[in-house]
């Protein structure tokens, strides 16, 4: 029977700068039961706090709610791991909220194919951010990929779209049938899950574009 | 203990690339940004790029976006810096660091440099 | 880029001695300057970010200040083991900047 080995923090995650959880991984259990406690303290204060809610990130969380949410302040957190044997402490970690979103998927993508009389035929895709970030303040700089394939294919193939929110794509093969979909990212952040894939069917007429 | 170990030095001919590598242990590599650093003899610092493990996302420093690039190989937990088309000023020490935390470009943890020289 | 200018270049101190270190940033940075101290053929050491706050386990006589375009680096009496090079860093902005360095030597 030992104490308890040293556990991580090794993930936080806000999907909208307004609430973040933070996930630990526990060290060794020692053979006996323990228990962890997570305090933090905000950049340039002493006073420690506790996790205010260890229930709605899952096992081995820490939540923080609206009204323990501060933007462009760092905290400083630590997880403490206790059994009879003793504690151990994890690394501390410093945390930006700012820095640590991961969006939903952006919205209402749609896949349209143009053919134009007077220029190559192409494909039209637009999409919407999710409705949890806001743009409008200017705190947010969303970038975005698309990825898509033909439906039997293996590879994705995969466009940066920067910032906006529509994009072309012109070499397609004639007659398949395409799945696309769409992601995005803070700027400093991390991509949200895959869009649902939105399948659009290239009609065979479709000129290759060279 | 977090630890990063670079690979040893290098000697190397103008208008060659070399590959500089980057071993992280004692945390979870995918938490925290990677960022490259280079320092000429006698010089200051200056930052070459930063990737993300978890997802290989990179940003660069325009002087060196054409030449340098950034990768992670996440099953081994090591990042590496290749720079191509080397010229004589391109000798220095360079430095692997860690981001400090889940946040803003400040470096807690470094590597012990590489030196390398580029010489004809 | 962000320009990022530290004076002086060099100081010759001796131990007990407070000295002082400024940087100054050719645009507003905020409070996103870190700053480090590195020995010789040795990696640099975080000492202080956000301008004013201490990383861990760095002692208490180091002290940041400032905000905006100048900051100051303070070490309020030198110890024998402080006598390094010091360069502060912007990160407000892209490329990531450092200072060109102050040699702090004994007198």
């Known amino acids: 029977q030992l104490p308890p080995g040293k556990p991580e923090i090794f993930k936080c995650r806000s999907p909208n700068k307004e609430t973040f959880t933070c996930w630990w991984r526990p060290g060794t259990d020692g053979g006996l039961p323990t228990n962890y406690s997570l305090t933090y303290h905000r950049e340039g204060e002493t006073l420690m706090h506790e996790c205010p809610d260890y229930i709605t990130g899952g096992p081995n969380s820490c939540h923080f709610g609206k009204q323990y949410t501060s933007m462009w302040r760092t905290y400083i957190m630590m997880v403490n791991a206790t059994n009879q044997m003793g504690s151990s402490f994890s690394d501390e970690l410093y945390v930006d909220v700012t820095y640590i979103v991961q969006p939903d998927p952006p919205l209402e993508l749609a896949v349209e194919v143009k053919q134009p009389e007077d220029r190559k035929p192409y494909l039209w895709i637009k999409w919407s951010p999710p409705t949890l970030i806001d743009l409008k303040t200017g705190w947010f700089t969303l970038l975005y990929e698309i990825r898509l394939k033909p439906e039997k294919a293996a590879e994705w193939e995969i466009h940066f779209a920067g910032q906006q929110t529509e994009f072309k794509i012109l070499s397609l093969h004639p007659g398949q049938k395409y799945l696309v979909q769409v992601r995005c990212k803070p700027d400093h952040g991390y991509w949200s899950a895959w869009s649902p894939a939105t399948f659009i069917q290239i009609p065979s007429d479709f000129t290759m574009n060279d | 203990e977090v630890q990063l170990v670079q690979s040893g030095a290098e000697v190397k001919k103008p208008g060659s690339s070399v590959k500089v590598s980057c071993k992280a242990s004692?945390?979870?590599?995918?938490?925290?940004?990677m960022h490259w650093v280079r320092q000429a003899p006698g010089q200051g610092l200056e930052w070459i790029g930063e990737?993300?493990?978890?997802?290989?996302?990179?940003n660069y420093n325009q002087k060196f976006k054409d030449r340098a690039t950034l990768t992670v190989d996440k099953s081994t937990s090591t990042a590496y810096m290749e720079l191509s088309s080397l010229r004589s000023e391109d000798t220095a020490v360079y430095y692997c660091?860690?981001?400090?935390?889940?946040?803003?470009?400040?470096?807690?943890?470094w590597g012990q440099g590489t030196l390398v020289t580029v010489s004809s | 880029d962000i320009q990022m200018t530290q004076s002086p270049s060099s100081v010759s101190a001796s131990v007990g001695d407070r000295v002082t270190i400024t940087c100054k940033a050719s645009q507003y940075v905020g409070t996103a300057v870190a700053w480090y101290q590195q020995k010789p053929g040795k990696a640099p050491k975080l000492l202080i970010y956000s301008a004013s706050n201490r990383y861990t386990g760095v002692p208490s006589r180091f002290s940041g200040s400032g905000s905006g375009t100048d900051f100051t680096l303070t070490i309020s009496s030198l110890q024998p083991e402080d006598f390094a090079t010091y360069y502060c860093?912007?990160?407000?902005?892209?490329?990531?900047?450092f200072g060109g360095g102050t040699k702090v030597e004994i007198k």
């Open positions: 990737i993300d493990p978890s997802d290989s996302y990179s």
């Open positions: 860093q912007q990160y407000s902005s892209y490329p990531w900047t």
């Open positions: 004692g945390y979870t590599f995918t938490t925290y940004w």
């Open positions: 660091a860690r981001n400090g935390g889940l946040g803003p470009a400040w470096f807690s943890y």
